[in-house]
Interface confidence: low
Amino acid sequence: MRTEAQVPALQPPEPGLEGAMGHRTLVLPWVLLTLCVTAGTPEVWVQVRMEATELSSFTIRCGFLGSGSISLVTVSWGGPNGAGGTTLAVLHPERGIRQWAPARQARWETQSSISLILEGSGASSPCANTTFCCKFASFPEGSWEACGSLPPSSDPGLSAPPTPAPILRADLAGILGVSGVLLFGCVYLLHLLRRHKHRPAPRLQPSRTSPQAPRARAWAPSQASQAALHVPYATINTSCRPATLDTAHPHGGPSWWASLPTHAAHRPQGPAAWASTPIPARGSFVSVENGLYAQAGERPPHTGPGLTLFPDPRGPRAMEGPLGVR
């Protein structure tokens, strides 16, 4: 979890009760609490978007919010790979990309997010309510997976919210590492909470700067990483009727929309638990001006300040020349 995560704005204390210094110390425990709860808890977000211009078009985007290095990303449909899902694409940060019909184009958007272009092909045609899952294998966190699909009543041009169904194969090293890093902060937090326990707890309010709207600063803090918002369109046949896979490149220019991470209880589960893991439905969606549906109160994913972009479909460390990494 990135440390620049947004924290809900706090209700200012009543005038006269506390000065500026007191307000700062009141905010600090909540900042630390957020970090203690979320730091070291990676998240996977998944977004499925249908284009308004082409009713049969989808874009699937997935991202990993964690500090570890990604070793492999697997995108599947029809459920997680271990529970009847079928692999659509596998992306390796150094060795390249593999994809299968009906996948048209898989690509890295950033070091920690990918997008997938799909198009139905015969019996492989997915329906509008098809579930797409992304699994990120990362060190030291382990493997994390989340699934998403378009709501049955989705309007064209709008995207489904990131759907939470994170599946963790916990990595002991990750757990121990996170524990060590957080120990000091959490002890300090308890100390501060004890000092402030006689004060009334502040009421949480939604941030005044709407966290539902895509924000370039939060989404792409560095100048280079602003290109991460340049997203390809996708194509999928949603009618569940046979379709022919053609070879033309997808149409469309940049789509300036951001996605939000999943927020759900991350519980350790083995692959056997995938089949029984329900994919909860999400409610309370807020429409935003650019056609993004987002859950109220959620924040956009963060990319690190040192983010390197890999628009080349061959991946981030693709070598040049005919013998380069493919």
Epitope: R95, R98, P322, L323
Partner: antibody, heavy 121, light 112 residues
């Protein structure tokens, strides 16, 4: 539709060379790496060579080092495999295939139809 | 080189019945990323091989769900829950952990 189209059957004499082509359509050759696999009639599959990220390029299996050359022409989206110093035991069906990857488990998702190379005096 | 050993080499089955093919590697195919780099292919008579299972257990697109892959490390299994006539051919396991990439000897599945 993704397709790999290979050149026609060849009959060669021992000691000669053979060059098999594999033209791809439906995807860009620059986004995929080509591997070559052969199958002696009635026998199993044998990997000749292909892309190895550890080496940073296309490499032959050690067994074929020195007499196997793999090249690609991205302008025509065609891959080539040339095997020299042919012996009778090189008689086999030669397949081009995309997607076998070293140390990453990429499967071969597309195969050419195969080119029968017969080495006979 | 990693040696892939398949068994049985010949597998006669009755239509509708189950089938199981074993593949053993001379060294572990489990990578640090947690994936097993073994793939299964079916070569039907007169055709090129076609992908069935990748990364040990991920069924390829368009492959019927009666096919499943399992196993980890050095022991892998391909199962067909209900064999159909169209499933006849030679099944190969392949390791992609290191070069040279190697295949099993193949298992010929035939209908009784």
């Amino acid at each position: 539709q993704v397709q790999l189209v290979q050149s026609g059957a060849e009959v060669k004499k021992p000691g000669a060379s053979v060059k098999v082509s594999c033209k791809v359509s439906g995807f860009s050759l620059s986004h995929f790496s080509m591997h070559w696999v052969r199958q002696v009639p009635g026998k199993g599959l044998e990997w000749l060579g292909g892309f190895d990220p550890e080496e940073g390029g296309t490499i032959p299996a050690q067994k074929f080092q020195g007499r196997l050359t793999m090249t690609e022409d991205t302008s025509t989206e065609t891959a080539y495999m040339e095997l020299s110093s042919l012996r009778s035991e090189d008689t086999a069906v030669y397949y081009c295939a995309t997607g076998i990857w070293y140390s990453s488990g990429w499967p071969v998702d597309y195969w050419g139809p195969g080119t029968l190379v017969t080495v006979s005096s | 080189d990693v040696v892939m050993t398949q068994s049985p080499l010949s597998l006669p089955v009755t239509p509708g019945g189950p089938a199981s093919i074993s593949c053993r590697s001379s060294q572990s195919l489990l990578d640090s990323s947690g994936y097993n780099y073994v793939d299964w292919y079916l070569q039907k008579p007169g055709q090129s091989p076609q992908l069935l299972i990748s990364l040990g257990s991920d069924r390829a697109s368009g492959v019927p769900d009666r096919f499943s892959g399992s196993g980890s490390g050095t022991d892998f299994t391909l199962k067909i829950s209900r064999v159909e006539a169209e499933d006849v051919g030679i099944y190969y396991c392949m390791q992609a952990l290191q070069t040279p990439i190697t295949f099993g000897q193949g298992t010929r599945l035939e209908i009784k």
